[in-house]
């Protein structure tokens, strides 16, 4: 079921509150039954990063699992956790931050000359249709098919971003992922959507650049939490991001 | 080397049924888009179905509730069935799948499907 | 849906003459930064093939003679300088927007 945050692939290596799927204006698709496209530009966030129930690794965002919060807990009451980085103890490969998986019990890098499939540094998406034949362990890799080594220009097809050249990250449009540039400052970004029905997002920003984020833009303050546009902003503070 | 291979192009009746395949080879099937174009003879192009990596699919107007695309990647193969085939329908039809650029950059060398009676 | 209107329809030329293909969008194809316009190539009995995409980026083996460019609704398929291989038709496409559609097509044809 389409229940889960369908995050912004290819987005790596950034707390959840920055990037995130875009919704675009209205445009004629016809898709798997049962898959739902936005309807208007719409910009729907929570402004504090609460924690987030889960069922499935991909209800959370690219930097997260679904897990107990506690050794042991309740198998029935999970949220999405914080990755873990190179060197931590895991038991499956989405425990593991991007760019790593999980070996013996560890997260070590993926690009390793000894790993030849390459860990997607994005989720590979499964949406809950019909075609869907992913597996929990398969979702997050992929064997690279790259057929060139250059990086991608804009408009590349690409599975992650590091297939993509500096300033451009992989994100979805329609049917493929490509290389788009990375938002600029002002620019419109997209929140993690959290709560509510979610549409499936077709259309993919790329996060905000180095020194930005993703914030609700000022004047914009007073709009209904469905509508707040937010846009790239230099930081004024250091961004809270959720430890366990 | 990328290799799309379309058959099961024929002559059928208006109405009857028709259905397509793509041979592919040379990529990681699974993880690529791939679609039908189609080309009325003498006419432009024309697509007329897509399906991504991850499994949903794209139909225009012209076709959507006839026409279903499919893939095996098991099988690294593409389909497209055809049902309620209509004079109009007659053309060229090729899979394309979009490797390096997000355009129709590999294409198979087309299955011709006549409808007529 | 976005309209593409390909002009000239035919293109007399010579061999070693430039050729300037046209193609309008009924609407801006430009988003994300990106020009999602695409050009083919089609020889007779012949599939596609693509020369340009994201408006002006070469695809993969075409010769530095073909270039693009544009951006909104406007663009421009370029040929320096014509080879007797370069006299077939050519498409624009856009992939903005689902469906994607392809321009009528543009003859280029040898004088």
């Known amino acids: 079921t389409l229940n889960s945050v369908l995050n912004s692939n290819a987005i790596k290596n950034l707390p959840p509150p920055l990037g995130g799927a875009a919704g675009h204006p209205g445009s004629a698709v016809s898709a798997a039954p049962g898959i739902l496209y936005p309807g208007g530009n719409k910009y729907q966030t929570i402004d504090n990063y609460q924690p987030y129930p889960c069922a499935e690794d991909e209800e959370c965002g690219t930097d997260e699992y679904c897990a107990s919060p506690t050794r042991g807990g309740d198998a029935g009451v999970q949220i999405c956790l914080a990755c873990r980085k190179r060197r931590k103890r895991c038991m499956r490969h989405a425990m593991c931050c991007p760019g790593n998986y999980c070996k013996n019990g560890i997260c070590v890098s993926s690009d390793q000359n000894h790993f030849r499939g390459e860990i997607e540094e994005t989720i590979t998406e499964s949406f809950g249709n019909d075609h869907s034949t992913l597996d929990g362990y398969s979702r997050r890799t992929t064997l690279s098919s790259k057929m060139y080594h250059t990086k991608g220009q804009e408009g590349s097809v690409c599975l992650r971003s590091s297939d993509c050249a500096s300033g451009l990250c992989c994100a979805r449009h329609f049917w493929s992922k490509i290389c788009k540039p990375v938002l600029k400052e002002g620019q419109v970004c997209t929140k993690h959507r959290r709560k509510g029905s979610h549409g499936l997002e077709i259309f993919q920003r790329c996060y905000c650049g180095e020194g930005l984020s993703c914030r609700i833009q000022k004047d914009h303050h007073q709009a209904s939490n469905s509508s707040r546009l937010h846009t790239c902003q230099r930081h004024h503070h250091h961004h809270h991001h959720h430890h366990h | 080397e990328v290799q799309l291979v379309e058959s099961g192009g024929g002559l059928v009746q208006p109405g009857g049924s028709l259905r397509l395949s793509c041979a592919a080879s040379?990529?990681?099937?699974?993880?690529?888009?791939i679609s039908w174009v189609r080309q009325a003879p003498g006419k432009g192009l024309e697509w007329v179905a897509s399906?991504?990596?991850?499994?949903?699919?794209y139909y225009p107007d012209s076709v959507k509730g006839r026409f279903t695309i499919s893939r095996d990647n098991a099988k690294n193969s593409l389909y497209l069935q055809m049902n309620s085939l209509r004079a109009e329908d007659t053309a060229v039809y090729y899979c394309a799948t979009s490797l390096q650029n997000y355009a129709f950059d590999y294409w198979g060398q087309g299955t011709t499907v006549t409808v007529s009676s | 849906e976005i309209v593409l209107t390909q002009s000239p329809a035919t293109l007399s030329l010579s061999p070693g003459e430039r050729a300037t293909l046209s193609c309008r969008a009924s609407e801006s194809v430009d988003d994300f930064g990106i020009s999602f316009i695409n050009w083919y190539q089609q020889k007779p009995g012949q599939a596609p093939r693509l020369l340009i995409y994201?408006?002006?980026k070469q695809g993969s083996g075409i010769p530095a003679r073909f270039s693009g460019s544009g951006s909104g609704t406007d663009f421009t398929l370029t040929i320096s300088s014509l080879e007797p291989e370069d006299f077939a038709v050519y498409y624009c496409?856009?992939?903005?927007?689902?469906?994607?559609?392809f321009g009528g097509g543009t003859k280029v044809e040898i004088k």
């Open positions: 496409q856009q992939l903005k927007e689902v469906p994607p559609t």
């Open positions: 040379g990529f990681t099937f699974s993880s690529y888009a």
């Open positions: 994201a408006g002006s």
């Open positions: 399906v991504s990596g991850w499994g949903d699919t």
